[in-house]
Interface confidence: low
Amino acid sequence: GCLTQLYENAFFRGGDVASMYTPNAQYCQMRCTFHPRCLLFSFLPASSINDMEKRFGCFLKDSVTGTLPKVHRTGAVSGHSLKQCGHQISACHRDIYKGVDMRGVNFNVSKVSSVEECQKRCTSNIRCQFFSYATQTFHKAEYRNNCLLKYSPGGTPTAIKVLSNVESGFSLKPCALSEIGCHMNIFQHLAFSDVDVARVLTPDAFVCRTICTYHPNCLFFTFYTNVWKIESQRNVCLLKTSESGTPSSSTPQENTISGYSLLTCKRTLPEPCHSKIYPGVDFGGEELNVTFVKGVNVCQETCTKMIRCQFFTYSLLPEDCKEEKCKCFLRLSMDGSPTRIAYGTQGSSGYSLRLCNTGDNSVCTTKTSTR
Amino acid sequence: IVGGTNSSWGEWPWQVSLQVKLTAQRHLCGGSLIGHQWVLTAAHCFDGLPLQDVWRIYSGILNLSDITKDTPFSQIKEIIIHQNYKVSEGNHDIALIKLQAPLNYTEFQKPICLPSKGDTSTIYTNCWVTGWGFSKEKGEIQNILQKVNIPLVTNEECQKRYQDYKITQRMVCAGYKEGGKDACKGDSGGPLVCKHNGMWRLVGITSWGEGCARREQPGVYTKVAEYMDWILEKTQSSDGKAQMQSPA
């Protein structure tokens, strides 16, 4: 189920799958929600620790049991991922942080009159992930009203420093507020060049596009279909970026499909989940559980309810069925995508709907914070 | 909203505009999306106009002037006015609207979380009121959704300011001693939301007040936490699953 409570003065011990810097616990929670394996997180505000390297530290954690031991740590904030929390699942983060400088690669500097204008510039720049703004009262006169647009390899700051008269925040592209607009077109038999930022396996180009949309550095992608000439590259989804923000070249190529991230769309973003079921397809991955259920839809529901389940395969092989029920293989992987995709099998596969934001789950659970 | 500022897209995705289409079409009240098929608003919005088919509910919008005849809207399946609401009083000013068709959630149209039943222990320090209502007492409906940050006022303090009315435990008040910021005509039914532990909750429903933004005259809101049993009872579907964002 969905758990939204935060535990103050508590830190989860162990289970680390990733760490990064975030300005507050809510942003850390959002990163946990979108991380394929993160179930729990712990955040260390600046006031909670003297170690400068761990200030603003956000620690993403996994656990086979869904929980980890809590240790007392003054000032720390811990909580759960919002996977399975329906409409609260959003990559949109509007807050502006006063007195904080989020560090990254500064790729653009301009003078603006307000922090809101700086955020708007970041939102309207295809490469900008976050920004810092020096206010009118910044101690160095030449930097006053400077708006620094930034990015980093992971989409989060490379460091966060406490600094008076500086305000920082994130791009509002995930809020569907970009003025850039987006290319909805899918280009058949076309491969894009440029830098690959990640490689995953997907059953079709639409899943590839959604993954690209929610990847911090993916601006466009190329997908190699299941009939691509090189077997080892079939169903490969290459997430790409470039300095200019658009592909520098494209090559006509049979059985490839290319397209763009939809992060810069105005008013609508795709849901961060994949609801389609793929008949005759087997998704390979680490086995989480095997259960007998009646029908592929029930298998998908079972996967969705089991928070660690990322995808599933429902087998229709006679040896995998008892009366009306057949085996439902609940699976996971390091990156949330199948480790292999096989065709021509007797069964169907699909993804967990835990990140779909249309669920009527009890997403507003509240419990008093532990002191 | 008096003393407010323009909202931005998706900032208050639960805010809806309740409009009436008679000879002309006008915004009448605000409301809050609390589930795919449920809107919470003030009962007094329907005084004299409880005809379901004259109402149009616009969700996922920021600017009323963007509404054209082609703008999609929801229609009402059922209006549920609190059984103890009296037209002549401010008590139990709460109503539920069941929409004819469920809405999909997007960044611009998604529900607000409801408080826990009888929530009295939470101290809310970051509360906002939103709406398209008047920006001054003798004003007019605003085009762009307005927002204003207003502190909650204790019921004891509120009662001192409204000697002629009974401020009950089922009401919550908000306002500045000096006035200047408040809800106003046309904001009725809309949300008073407070952010606590990173989560927005629907604390109040804009109900009434003496004038707008007057000194020492806070706005009075229906206290949602006090009506959680009623909301859950009315929104419970036939399969026994609550159809809105309720606390566990």
Partner: antibody, heavy 122, light 106 residues
């Protein structure tokens, strides 16, 4: 003291026009829905028209729709009823009315003017 | 449109009598009903709203009941000042009055 004072009535020929006014005092006029109600000689009460506090919404009885127009000027605390294409059956005492309560609502009417007589006759 | 039908049209009674006037709505109006008293040459006076709530300053001998489509106004003990015409009014959807009931001296 709360008061409503109607004016503008008189004798008019069928097809003619009249504009009634209702001057309000003693309350915050702009907060309230205002009504016109009429009463033909020796007959019952008939609701004619209503206008929402901002003036944005107007509602009419079927018998007057398209002929009568209700309006208000909140800065002058005045309610109006523009009556066009008058018929003999429009002959009546015209009252303006509203509901005086702490919380502005639409409701029964507890404050009425004294009425103004409109006679439509050739 | 909602029609309101009052009965009787005329009622003859004496001081001290218990008087009952009924009002029927053509469709359910919940409890959105008011009762008025009107004397010749005067504006109507609100007695009861929300079917049964006595307006401030109205004597307690007046009472109202009913919901949905059937409503009743009762004067428990008729006083000389009560001889007048009584109207019901629905305000569920717009506003409609009944045709009136004249209470006259027997």
């Amino acid at each position: 003291e709360v008061q409503l004072l109607e004016s503008g009535g008189g004798l008019v020929q069928p097809g003619g026009s009249l504009r009634l006014s209702c001057a309000a005092s003693g309350f915050t006029f702009s907060h309230y829905i205002m009504m016109w109600v009429r009463q033909a000689p020796g007959k019952g009460l008939e609701w004619v028209s209503g206008i929402y506090s901002s003036g944005g919404i107007t509602v009419y009885a079927d018998s007057v729709k398209g002929r009568f127009t209700i309006s208000r000027d909140n800065s002058k605390n005045t309610l109006y009823l523009q009556m066009n294409s008058l018929r003999a059956e429009d002959t009546a005492v015209y009252y303006c009315a509203y509901r005086r309560i702490g919380v502005p609502r639409r409701d029964a009417f507890d404050i009425w003017g004294q009425g103004t007589m409109v006679t439509v006759s050739s | 449109d909602i029609q309101m039908t009052q009965s009787p049209s005329t009622l003859s009674a004496s001081v001290g009598d218990r008087v009952t006037i009924t009002c029927r709505a053509s469709q359910s109006i919940s409890s959105w009903l008011a009762w008025y008293q009107q004397k010749p040459g005067k504006a109507p006076n609100l007695l009861i709203y929300k079917a049964s709530t006595l307006e401030s300053g109205v004597p307690s001998r007046f009472s109202g009941s009913g919901s949905g489509t059937e409503f009743t106004l009762t004067i428990s003990s008729l006083q000389p000042d009560d001889f007048a015409t009584y109207y019901c009014q629905q305000y569920n959807t717009y506003w409609t009055f009944g045709q009136g009931t004249k209470v006259e001296i027997k």
